[in-house]
């Protein structure tokens, strides 16, 4: 049994780190493999993660952790029974992928404006809470040529779009993702998308 692509891990800077890797051939990850992790810290214990399959030769493991601080460093050991396949280390604060924003809602009852709101995925006491900026993707299933990214660089998780900039009488979808500039993170996954119908019509004089 051989590791084809070494484990690569990212942390949500809250309570979970996700490690993914590829094996040299088809593997039943949960039956054949264990990923052991231990914080380099006085009197810490070794913890075990049971991986799941992620495609035929891919494995993924979700490591449960305490809150992340910048000093944290983990040793990682990938075992197949008594055989050590790979040994490495992981510093969560240097490999952060934020959680995806949630509760994306579209408010169309505001005159002339489409208001999008969503929730910050972190509690206020988390360091990432005040560091997230967002990208909102809006597209139309009726008009495949229309797709826009709106960068939200302020803290408030809202975006206002003049309804007049969207075509009337067709449906739109939106999704949002986040990243934290000062932590040099990757982008989060996209939130689930939400759909709305743009019924806005320009006043008669402007037609």
């Amino acid at each position: 049994m051989k590791v084809l692509q070494e484990p690569a891990c990212v942390s949500d800077y809250m309570s979970i780190s996700t490690c993914e890797w590829k094996m040299g051939g088809p593997t039943n990850c949960s039956a054949e493999l264990r990923l052991l992790y231990q914080l380099v810290f006085q009197s810490s214990e070794t913890h075990t993660c049971v991986p799941e399959n992620n495609g035929g030769v891919g494995c993924v493991c979700h490591l449960l952790m305490d809150d992340v601080v910048s000093m944290d460093n983990y040793t990682l050991d990938l075992w197949a029974g008594q055989q050590l396949l790979w040994k490495g280390s992981f510093k969560p604060s240097e490999h952060v992928k934020p959680r995806a924003p949630g509760n994306l809602t579209v408010h169309t009852n505001v005159s002339d404006t489409v208001l999008l709101t969503w929730s910050n995925p972190y509690p206020p006491d988390n360091y990432l809470y005040n560091d997230l900026t967002y990208a909102v993707n809006i597209w139309s299933e009726n008009d495949p040529a229309y797709s826009r990214i709106h960068n939200v660089t302020y803290l408030k998780p809202t975006l206002r779009i003049p309804a007049s900039t969207l075509k009337s009488g067709i449906s739109y979808r939106a999704r949002v993702r986040a990243w934290a500039q000062h932590y040099n993170t990757t982008w989060s996954e996209w939130s689930p998308s939400t759909k709305w119908y743009n019924s806005y019509r320009e006043p008669f004089e402007q037609r």
Epitope: L39, Q42, E45, V69, S70, D72
Partner: antibody, heavy 125, light 112 residues
């Protein structure tokens, strides 16, 4: 009541051996790391050894490394210190102390918040 | 090894007066914000040490509020706002950042 009671001290000749025991009660013994600290007559406190809750990680002062072995039996709620190749400078009162909660991924530290009454080890010919 | 240097080594105090003991570590004991791995212990004559302060500033259960700990990184202080006769003994700082844990030399607090 959270309590630690040491035993096993005594008079031993240089080169001899002793095994100290520390019985814990009133807390979930296996969840906590444990530590031995000693105090030579008229001197300050000196850390000797520590062990994680499961016993998988052990730590020793350079002065005792290779001679002393820390261990625990969680089924008996008891901590041990096996002392071999004893020297005159090992003469001290030995205390066991409750250390950090080590079942969490990052052990939680509350100080050495419970200490035993101490057991005296005298190494002399 | 981390060296803990305590001062003063002897501290004569009048009852009701404040007292202060300093401890300097040879390297930072700050692991993350609010988590300085330094403790303060009091050992009264003929007794086992007892925990006063842990993580730099957190008062242990049952410790009177006249005891307080402060500092961060390498410099730490134990303050007693009003010394009482029962406070006499040896005070030790200890770093628990990593092994080997190391203690200061001890400060003997006595009543004038």
């Amino acid at each position: 009541e959270v309590q630690l009671v040491e035993s096993g001290g005594g008079l031993e000749q240089p080169g001899g051996s002793l095994r100290l025991s520390c019985a814990g009660s009133g807390f979930t013994f296996r969840d906590f790391a444990m530590t031995w600290v000693r105090q030579a007559p008229g001197k300050g406190l000196e850390w000797v050894s520590s062990i994680s809750g499961s016993g998988s990680s052990t730590y020793y002062a350079d002065s005792v490394k290779g001679r002393f072995t820390i261990s625990r039996d969680n089924s008996k709620n008891t901590l041990y210190l096996q002392m071999n190749s004893l020297r005159a400078e090992d003469t001290a009162v030995y205390y066991c102390a409750k250390d950090r909660l080590s079942v969490t991924v990052r052990p939680r530290y509350y100080g050495l918040d419970v200490w035993g009454q101490g057991t005296t080890v005298t190494v002399s010919s | 090894d981390i060296v803990m240097t305590q001062s003063p080594l002897s501290l004569p105090v009048t009852p009701g007066e404040p007292a202060s003991i300093s401890c300097t570590a040879s390297q930072s004991l700050l692991y993350s914000i609010g988590y300085n791995y330094v403790d303060w212990y009091l050992q009264k004559s003929g007794q086992s040490p007892q925990l006063l302060i842990y993580l730099g500033s957190k008062r242990a259960s049952g410790v009177p509020d006249r005891f307080s700990g402060s500092g961060s990184g390498t410099d730490f202080t134990l303050k007693i706002s009003r010394v009482e006769a029962e406070d006499v003994g040896f005070y030790y700082c200890m770093q628990a950042y990593n092994s080997p844990y190391t203690f200061g030399q001890g400060t003997k607090l006595e009543i004038k």
